[in-house]
Amino acid sequence: QPNNSLMLQTSKENHALASSSLCMDEKQITQNYSKVLAEVNTSWPVKMATNAVLCCPPIALRNLIIITWEIILRGQPSCTKAYKKETNETKETNCTDERITWVSRPDQNSDLQIRTVAITHDGYYRCIMVTPDGNFHRGYHLQVLVTPEVTLFQNRNRTAVCKAVAGKPAAHISWIPEGDCATKQEYWSNGTVTVKSTCHWEVHNVSTVTCHVSHLTGNKSLYIELLPVPGAKKSAK
């Protein structure tokens, strides 16, 4: 039986490419200068297939000597992108991913952008700004989030299976009403996890069961009406 009886989908996906950034405008820079410099490292969850902009500490570009972005991705050598103001030159070392670029010319904007974030962009990104007043750092632990594909079906007598396939991190599955449930997790080499919850309802007045999937990218619910037990007699009149 299809999800939610007659194709009723419980969440409408928006596939427009979203953009996320932790950058601040200049007003915030002046207000939060000292606070930001103290907060060196940030954990940052970003949805897969969106665009991400990572920012350096809010230092006026006129005070700069060198800007360096250091990028450490799992299973790859450290990549560095550097800009030297005095000679107006940029240099890259071990950087192979063409989706990770300066937002614009580094003499105008020190921010780094990732176009269409992929699972492989999970990692640590650090901006180091060398100035006459010292070195200023800002680091990001970028956690790429992958929305799981959710399915719900009935496989045998009053038993339903809800799957949250290839999510990152693992999704959490709950049911309305609660049943006799077993949950399994399957880990994939790309870092995603499939969660499968199988539930049985012995109580015969349970009509519709709802699988609720909680995930950092958003929650989703699907429901189905349980099929009659094969061979069930018609209700006594």
Epitope: S5, L6, P177, E178, T210, Y223, E225, L227
Partner: antibody, heavy 114, light 107 residues
């Protein structure tokens, strides 16, 4: 698209029976429960029962067990509800609904009058 | 049976107002719920399914929320066409049960 077609009205005598129809289209009729709902004039909604066309399995609210009988004709994708021993209390609009209440027929007004 | 207690039974509000109505499941039962709008002489129309999800084609001024066994339907900016009766339905357990309805009138 999913459609549930019901006749507009039925005029019946007290004590008689009436068989209401609900013709389904736009989906696999045998794969989804069909529910029937009663609404008396100016009143709320009451669930009567449901039927699974794939097997003929039925469930009834206790209140309607001796009043309503649900059947289907899968060849014409039509659900039926027979209401027996009609009284003025049975004068109401009767709806069929499927897809966990997503889709509704327009309702049949049953008037019980001598 | 799961009883659905709906309140208020009637409500009068002005155009542009925010209005809310609630349904509560008896005995603290864990259920799923749909909200409907019904106009005189018409079949109920599904607005919200699964307590919080907006049905296709329904204006975004309608929203649903849940807190435990309490469910709320909110209309964020009342329009003339919203004058109708609103029902909730729990479809988790048989028999399905409806709230008594909230009749919404425009001042």
């Amino acid at each position: 698209q999913v459609q549930l077609q019901q006749p507009g009205s039925e005029l019946v005598r007290p004590g008689a029976s009436v068989k209401l129809s609900c013709k389904a289209s736009g989906y696999t009729f045998t794969s989804y429960w069909m529910h029937w709902v009663k609404q008396r004039p100016g009143q709320g909604l009451e669930w009567i029962g449901n039927i699974y066309p794939g097997s003929g399995t039925t469930n009834y609210d206790e209140k309607f067990k001796s009043k309503a009988t649900l059947t289907v004709d899968t060849s014409s994708s039509t659900a039926y509800m027979q209401i027996s021993s009609l009284t003025s209390e049975d004068s109401a609009v009767y709806y069929c609904t499927t897809g966990t209440s997503t889709y509704w027929g327009q309702g049949t007004l049953v008037t019980v009058s001598a | 049976d799961v009883q659905m207690i709906q309140s208020p039974s009637s409500l009068s509000a002005s155009l542009g107002d925010i209005v809310t109505m609630t349904c509560q499941a008896s005995q603290g039962t864990s259920i799923n719920l749909n909200w409907f709008q019904q106009k005189p002489g018409k079949a109920p129309k599904l607005l919200i399914y699964g307590a919080v999800n907006l049905e296709d084609g329904v204006p975004s001024r309608f929203s649903g929320s849940r807190y435990g066994t309490d469910f709320t339907l909110t209309v964020s900016s009342l329009e003339d066409e919203d004058m109708a009766t609103y029902f909730c339905l729990q479809h988790t357990y048989l028999p399905w049960t409806f709230g008594g309805g909230t009749k919404l009138e425009i001042k």
